[in-house]
């Protein structure tokens, strides 16, 4: 289930240009903005998706408290540099030669500097906390039903193995989905938790990245689960390095 042969499209990434010019006349798809060939049987990396997005025309608590090293993507969109495999390069710079280091999901993890800034390695984000608030419902969702549906969603829609969904917490109206994936746990072919989280984030905003597949229709025992806000926290294997100035 790579690129769909019949009409030569990429089921997992609508931000591609596809043509039957692959080996043996097979459908091959390339990401907009970068021209990198993508595997349409799995999720496209967040780096290539952000690059494509920038190239497109403009138009009693059971809940987890993120620790002090948790990062939130406050910087918004930027046009990233991706390596040949589609991963974020550790150092990102803008057109005015301002540079910063990012983690594996492309979120800034240092203060901004100049072209002399060094980012020795791409630090892996190994724990992602997706914090959702759902619209009011007549009654709270059953926690175990909600847990089951969200795990199934991540497996079937985003192809993320259930072992990487560490927990689903619920305290009406807040839902928290914890994704965990250490470097040692991630095998070849496994979807990255960062990519799954990004696809999910776009889905809940009504901006599905899937081609031809319907938008996200999440139901728990037939009751629609409608998300009204999303906040995503990222925890890296090595804590971020910000100056005290930013923390005050």
């Amino acid at each position: 289930h790579t690129a769909a042969q019949d009409n030569c499209t990429c089921p997992t990434n609508k931000m591609t240009v596809c043509s039957p010019d692959g080996p043996g006349g097979r459908c091959q798809c390339r990401a907009l903005g970068s021209g990198v060939a993508v595997d349409c049987s799995t999720l496209t990396s967040k780096c290539l998706l952000l690059k494509a997005r920038m190239s497109a025309p403009k138009n009693a608590r059971t809940l987890v408290r993120p620790n002090e090293h948790a990062l939130v993507d406050n910087d918004g969109l930027y046009d990233p540099d991706c390596d040949p495999e589609g991963r974020f390069k550790a150092r990102q710079c803008n057109q005015t030669s301002v540079c910063w280091c990012v983690n594996s999901v492309g979120v800034r993890r240092t203060d901004k500097g100049d072209l002399s800034l060094r980012c020795d390695e791409l630090v892996r984000t190994h724990h992602i906390l997706i914090d959702l608030r759902h619209r009011p419902t007549a009654s709270a969702f059953n926690h175990s039903d909600l847990d089951a549906e969200l795990r199934r969603l991540f497996r079937e829609r985003y192809r993320l193995h259930p072992k990487f969904v560490a927990a689903v917490h619920y305290e009406q109206p807040t839902i928290q989905i914890e994704l965990r994936q250490n470097t040692s746990q991630k095998a070849a072919g496994d979807v990255d938790i960062g990519d799954a989280a990004y696809y999910f984030e776009r889905d809940v905003k009504g901006e599905s990245l899937f081609q031809g597949r319907g938008g996200l229709d999440l139901r728990v025992r037939g009751e629609p689960l409608q998300v009204e806000r999303t906040l995503i926290y990222y925890l890296d294997e090595i804590p971020p390095k910000f100056s005290m100035k930013r923390l005050t």
């Epitope: 289930h1 497996r155 079937e156 597949r213």
Partner: antibody, heavy 118, light 109 residues
Framework: QSLEESGGDLVQPGASLTLTCKAS????????MLWVRQAPGKGLEWIGC???????TYFASWATGRFAISKTSSTTVTLQMTSLTAADTATYFC?????????????WGPGTLVTVSS | YDMTQTPASVSAAVGGTVTIKCQAS??????LAWYQQKPGQPPKLLIY???DLASGVPSRFKGSGSGTEYTLTISALECDDAATYYC????????????FGGGTEVVVK
């Protein structure tokens, strides 16, 4: 790597029965385990599934309520069945997915026969 | 996601070819498997992802299709191919009655 079902029996209508699936040679936590049944001379019928990591269970619409699946030890999964009728007479198989995120069943037990009759 | 398999039974001579079709009620994105089952045995995975051969399966077995329409073709039939074949959608287990097609009995003359 192998699976083996046990617990099949001749039971009366209305009875309950628990089947056990014993796994050998692999770590259950990396897989989903599914139960499938086959009535004599009929086709395969999916009953339900458990994601071992997380323990969440899923059932065919006709099986919801009367069937339950659980992981009972590091190597065993059970299928509990209640209010059995003659229509539940079948060979019951447990099967393992291939460790991907699809539900391809690449390892099956030999099956255990359940007969519901008065 | 109902799976409709045709025909229910097919007969062909040794060395011949049989074709089995499977139709899904909705797009299953090529997440389709084919199984072979012989009497008294559990099913055996033959093909996954609509066209990829499982380990040890001879290349006489060929799967094809996409969207909602899928086909299993067995060429150069051998006596040992006499069995019942089932398709299975491996895309979702949400709100469904069955993941399997009804089965096709292959008789080799």
């Amino acid at each position: 790597q192998s699976l083996e079902e046990s617990g099949g029996d001749l039971v009366q209508p209305g009875a309950s029965l628990t089947l056990t699936c014993k796994a050998s040679g692999f770590d259950l936590n990396n897989y989903a385990m599914l139960w499938v049944r086959q009535a004599p001379g009929k086709g395969l019928e999916w009953i339900g599934c458990i994601y071992i990591s997380g323990g969440t269970t899923y059932f065919a619409s006709w099986a919801t309520g009367r069937f339950a699946i659980s992981k009972t030890s590091s190597t065993t999964v059970t299928l509990q069945m209640t209010s059995l009728t003659a229509a539940d007479t079948a060979t019951y198989f447990c099967a393992r997915d291939d460790g991907s995120t699809s539900y391809y069943l690449n390892l099956w037990g030999p099956g255990t026969l359940v007969t519901v009759s008065s | 996601y109902d799976m409709t398999q045709t025909p229910a039974s097919v007969s062909a001579a040794v060395g011949g070819t049989v074709t089995i079709k499977c139709q899904a009620s909705e797009d299953i994105y090529s997440l389709l498997a084919w199984y072979q089952q012989k009497p008294g045995q559990p099913p055996k995975l033959l093909i996954y992802d609509a066209s990829d051969l499982a380990s040890g399966v001879p290349s006489r077995f060929k799967g094809s299709g996409s969207g909602t329409e899928y086909t299993l073709t067995i060429s150069a039939l051998e006596c040992d191919d006499a069995a019942t074949y089932y398709c299975q959608q491996a895309y979702t287990i949400g709100n469904i009655d069955n993941t399997f097609g009804g089965g096709t009995e292959v008789v080799v003359k």
